[in-house]
Interface confidence: low
């Protein structure tokens, strides 16, 4: 292996000075040839101060960081090459404003599998200005960052994440956003409008019931939209038209509890003619009971009736 492990006695290097070119922080493995530092599964409680300046890929996974303060990666001279930062599974419960400041080349950030009770609105923008300097981030991976119920703040988790994504319009250059497995009940209305460069959006394995108030209209570059494993009952005409209008999009809708009643007619018609939905032949009804497991593409208007006994408010979301 081209990775060199540091000896523990190197840990006392003076943090005020720039690290030696070949220095590797204690409890880390470093490869200058691969421009990679791995400090993985070492129960670190803070980000090492003496990271080598050549680092381009930094793995800090499986630690116990708890809090990421402002300037957690700010160094003098700065870590100008750092492009990919993986902090997944490091027991972070707080990411503060400016945590990723002074990383001018940071393209990919993975915070997945951290129970984020607090994500500052300015975690990614760095400042509270209404329009911040653009973030260099291209890929932001936030899968399973929902904290346990007893650690949640009073405000909605969806709102907290949305605020961080839209603050200062800093993420206008973001191409990839993964928000899977976060128990989202809804997607805040204005989030996607602030992310016009998105190519890939993963909202799978959430609890989204409806997309009625979500607009995809300005996501003209969107190529993949993952909505598998949610609680979607039907897609309404406005959503269908917006998706059809996106020039490159592929939509994934598997494993949603589709309600095959009279409100499903427009969606079935759309499914039969669209090229947008991948694996559309696998979509099946979950409700009502008499329609369970019927394939959506095989339905016709005669199959899609509403029970007149039910009040309209119970017939659809």
């Amino acid at each position: 292996s081209s990775f060199s492990s540091s000896a523990p006695f190197l840990a006392s290097a003076a943090s005020a000075q720039p690290p030696l070119p070949d220095q590797c922080p204690a409890l880390c493995e470093c490869s200058e040839a691969a421009r990679t530092v791995k400090c993985v599964n070492r129960n670190l409680t803070e980000v090492p101060t003496d990271l080598p300046l050549y680092v381009r890929n930094l793995f800090l996974t499986g630690n116990q960081l708890a809090v990421l303060p402002a300037g957690a990666f700010a160094r003098r001279p700065p870590l100008a090459e750092l492009a990919a930062l993986n902090l997944s599974g490091s027991r972070l419960d707080e990411v503060r404003a400016g945590a990723f400041e002074h990383l001018p080349s940071l393209r990919q950030l993975d915070l997945s599998h951290n129970p984020l009770a607090y994500l500052s609105p300015f975690a990614f923008s760095g400042s509270n200005a209404s329009i911040s300097a653009p973030s260099p981030l291209v890929e932001l991976i936030l899968n399973h960052i929902v904290p346990p119920d007893d650690k949640r703040q009073n405000r909605s988790f969806e709102g907290m994440v949305a605020a961080a994504l839209v603050a200062g319009r800093a993420l206008q250059g973001l191409h990839l956003l993964e928000l899977a497995s976060n128990h989202f009940l809804y997607l805040p209305r204005d989030v996607l409008a602030q992310l016009p460069s998105l190519r890939y959006l993963d909202l799978s394995n959430n609890s989204l019931v409806s997309l009625t108030y979500v607009s995809f209209r300005n996501l003209t570059h969107l190529e993949s939209l993952h909505l598998e494993d949610n609680a979607l009952k039907v897609l309404h005409n406005g959503t269908l038209a917006e998706l059809q209008g996106l020039p490159h999009v592929r939509v994934f809708l598997d494993n949603n509890p589709w309600v095959c009643d009279c409100h499903m007619a427009d969606m079935v018609t759309w499914l039969k003619q669209t090229e947008v939905v991948q694996g559309k032949d696998r979509l099946t009804c979950a409700f009502p009971e008499k329609m369970r497991n019927r394939v959506l593409l095989e339905l016709n208007s005669a199959d899609l009736d509403c029970d007149p006994i039910l009040p309209p408010s119970l017939q659809t979301s």
Epitope: S112, H175, D229
Partner: antibody, heavy 121, light 107 residues
Framework: EVQLLESGGGLVQPGGSLRLSCAAS????????MSWVRQAPGKGLEWVSS????????YYADSVKGRFTISRDNSKNTLYLQMNSLRAEDTAVYYC??????????????WGQGTLVTVSS | DIQMTQSPSSLSASVGDRVTITCRAS??????LNWYQQKPGKAPKLLIY???SLQSGVPSRFSGSGSGTDFTLTISSLQPEDFATYYC?????????FGQGTKLEIK
């Protein structure tokens, strides 16, 4: 370092069964979609089956549908392929592979070394 | 299903040569094309994704181009370790399909 290690291959008679395993390490297995790809002796690559990272979505080539089952155990970082009703034409090296995670996600960026399945009487 | 067709199926070349392999998709796949290298008895290795992006650690003598239905893999100056079989793969759909392969042999 990403590592994928297949096991479970061997010689089996037509109509028999085998279960392949792929032990993963060096990456967040539970966040990665996975695939099985096979290669018959002297032939090209043929996709067999894929599974979403959560295990919720499973997909199969027409040639194996109804006979093969892909599954995963994220707690054990292991991918499986249960192969039933095996035929001579299933003889191949079976590779497990990870779906890459970049802006264009549909590539297979890491592969195991493969395990040989031979179906013969 | 999208069919992928590679040409040529085999070719002979010498160290230092510039080599081009082509791949054609049966329908437009935008830039969702990947290239792999496979040596005898070894697993395939991802070289290029999204038509032209070099996978980390792959030498810069490899390059890819194309969009829509027609794609090329170019090796600017063949090295001894480059003699192998090369496969293209469409990544437009979640379920991959591969070309039949191009075997690059020493002349």
């Amino acid at each position: 370092e990403v590592q994928l290690l297949e096991s479970g291959g061997g010689l089996v008679q037509p109509g028999g069964s085998l279960r392949l395993s792929c032990a993963a390490s060096g990456f967040t297995f539970s966040g990665s979609s996975m695939s099985w790809v096979r290669q018959a002796p002297g032939k090209g690559l043929e996709w067999v089956s894929s599974i979403y990272y959560s295990g919720s979505g499973t997909y199969y080539a027409d040639s194996v549908k109804g006979r093969f089952t892909i599954s995963r155990d994220n707690s054990k970082n292991t991918l499986y392929l249960q192969m039933n009703s095996l035929r001579a034409e299933d003889t191949a090296v079976y590779y497990c592979a990870r779906y890459g995670r970049n802006v264009h996600p549909y590539n297979l960026d890491y592969w195991g070394q493969g395990t040989l399945v031979t179906v013969s009487s | 299903d999208i069919q992928m067709t590679q040409s040529p199926s085999s070719l002979s070349a010498s160290v230092g040569d510039r080599v081009t392999i082509t791949c054609r998709a049966s329908q437009s796949i935008s830039s969702y094309l990947n290239w792999y290298q496979q040596k005898p008895g070894k697993a395939p290795k991802l070289l290029i994704y999204a038509a032209s992006s070099l996978q980390s650690g792959v030498p810069s003598r490899f390059s890819g181009s194309g969009s829509g239905t027609d794609f090329t893999l170019t090796i600017s100056s063949l090295q001894p370790e480059d003699f192998a079989t090369y496969y293209c793969q469409q990544g437009y759909y979640y379920l991959p399909t591969f070309g039949q392969g191009t075997k690059l042999e020493i002349k």
